[in-house]
């Protein structure tokens, strides 16, 4: 149930936005799939986790991710909203103590083991541009979204609001 305005309008605000409370306002477990219904899976290899985008076999169980939602305040001079200019930020954890991180230098999405408080690289601004689809924008790099590239998750720069409907940054959440 998640749309987006021109990215540029709010990009500066992301750097300055503060998460209003250290505990999430809600959490749920969901499986993550691409717009084209490929599953996001996580595999332990050589003591580190790898993230894959793949077609699952018919009865293969989907991996679940814990999504934790945090309220984050736009600076009032950016949004003009005062108290009501709230964004939702999420962290994504497929297994205990591991969170998805944005590696902006490598343009990659990685799983890192870390303790709370989580670093900014683990927070993503939630958008939805289509019914039932969500997108994840890096808190640390506004205008850059988690996307699919060559059957892996990668960071993808979205340079204008016209490109925000590009299918490779759209994801579906489901309970099954």
């Amino acid at each position: 149930a998640f749309g987006i305005s021109g990215v540029q309008k709010y990009t500066r605000a992301l750097h300055d936005s503060s998460i209003t409370g250290i505990s999430p306002i809600t959490e749920y477990l969901a499986s993550l799939s691409t717009y084209n219904d490929q599953s996001i899976t996580f595999a332990l290899e050589d003591e580190s986790y790898e993230i894959y985008v793949e077609d699952l076999k018919k009865d293969e169980k989907k991996d679940k991710v814990l999504l934790s939602y945090y309220e984050s305040q736009h600076p009032s001079n950016e949004s003009g909203d005062g108290v009501d200019g709230k964004m939702l930020m999420v962290t994504l954890s497929p297994t205990k103590d591991f969170w998805l991180h944005a590696n902006n230098k490598e343009h990659s999405v990685e799983l890192h083991k870390c303790e709370k408080p989580l670093p900014d690289q683990a927070f993503f601004v939630l958008h939805n541009m289509h019914s039932n689809c969500v997108s994840f924008e890096c808190k640390t790099d506004p205008g850059v979204f988690i996307g699919v590239k060559d059957n892996h998750l990668a960071l993808i720069k979205v340079d204008s609001s016209e490109n925000l409907c590009t299918e490779n940054i759209l994801f579906k959440l489901s309970e099954t």
């Epitope: 149930a1 305005s5 309008k9 809600t26 909203d81 009501d84 709230k86 939702l88 939805n128 039932n132």
Partner: antibody
């Protein structure tokens, strides 16, 4: 102050058209999902449709074809164009705004509503 | 088409009573459900979002629970100002829906 004010309601004959406006103040309308909701006299709330910040629009199944949602960012105003109106479209029409930017979410800000009466 | 089924359609209760209203989604909406209170001649007012999060300024006697397809709004001790109509809404799917709102529950004085 964050506020929504609807206008444009009134009496219209069956088969006629009407355009409702919803003027937003205190926030940028284009950053939020904006929704139209209606309520027939003595009935429940009925979701009409939504315009996303990226201009995607979704309508209730019954509203497709007759109702059109649009917005003018320069005027910070939301619109609902209603065509081929019927007696059963008689209702108070509300515009509403989601609680969060970018995300379709709960409706935290509502207008006062504008009454549309379809009658000959 | 996607639907929200709310029950009961009306309930008679006294001040101090515990009132429970339920809402069922025709398919899973995770926890994307909100609850509204509406009084005659007024616009709806947000009470609960994300199924259980209390909206700003809403008294703690209101609470919400549920996930997936089944959701509940509870008023722990009904106050005179709580006599109103309550609606659930799914905030998940905007595609192919008849109505995002439930049919409403009128809470009346016994």
């Amino acid at each position: 102050e964050v506020q929504l004010v609807e206008s444009g309601g009134g009496l219209v004959q069956p088969g006629g058209s009407l355009r409702l406006s919803c003027a937003a103040s205190g926030f940028s309308l284009s950053s939020y999902h904006m929704i139209w909701v209606r309520q027939a006299p003595g009935k429940g709330l009925e979701w009409v449709g939504v315009i996303y910040p990226n201009s995607n629009i979704y309508y209730a199944t019954w509203a497709k074809g007759r109702f059109t949602i649009s917005r003018d960012n320069s005027k910070n105003t939301l619109y609902l164009q209603m065509n081929s109106l019927r007696a059963e479209d008689t209702a108070v029409y509300y515009c509403a705004r989601t609680i969060y930017v970018h995300v379709y979410s709960a409706l935290s800000i509502w207008g006062q509503g504008t009454l549309v009466t379809v009658s000959s | 088409a996607f639907q929200m089924t709310q029950s009961p359609s009306s309930v008679s209760a006294s001040v101090g009573d515990r009132v429970t209203i339920t809402c069922q989604a025709s398919e899973s909406v995770l926890n994307e459900v909100s609850w509204y209170q509406q009084k005659p001649g007024k616009a709806p007012k947000l009470l609960i979002y994300f199924a259980s999060k209390l909206a700003s300024g809403v008294p703690s006697r209101f609470s919400g629970s549920g996930s997936g397809t089944d959701f509940t709004l509870t008023i722990s001790s009904l106050q005179p100002e709580d006599f109103a109509t309550y609606y659930c809404q799914q905030d998940w799917s905007m595609d192919n829906i008849d109505n995002a709102f439930g049919g409403g529950t009128k809470v009346e004085i016994k």
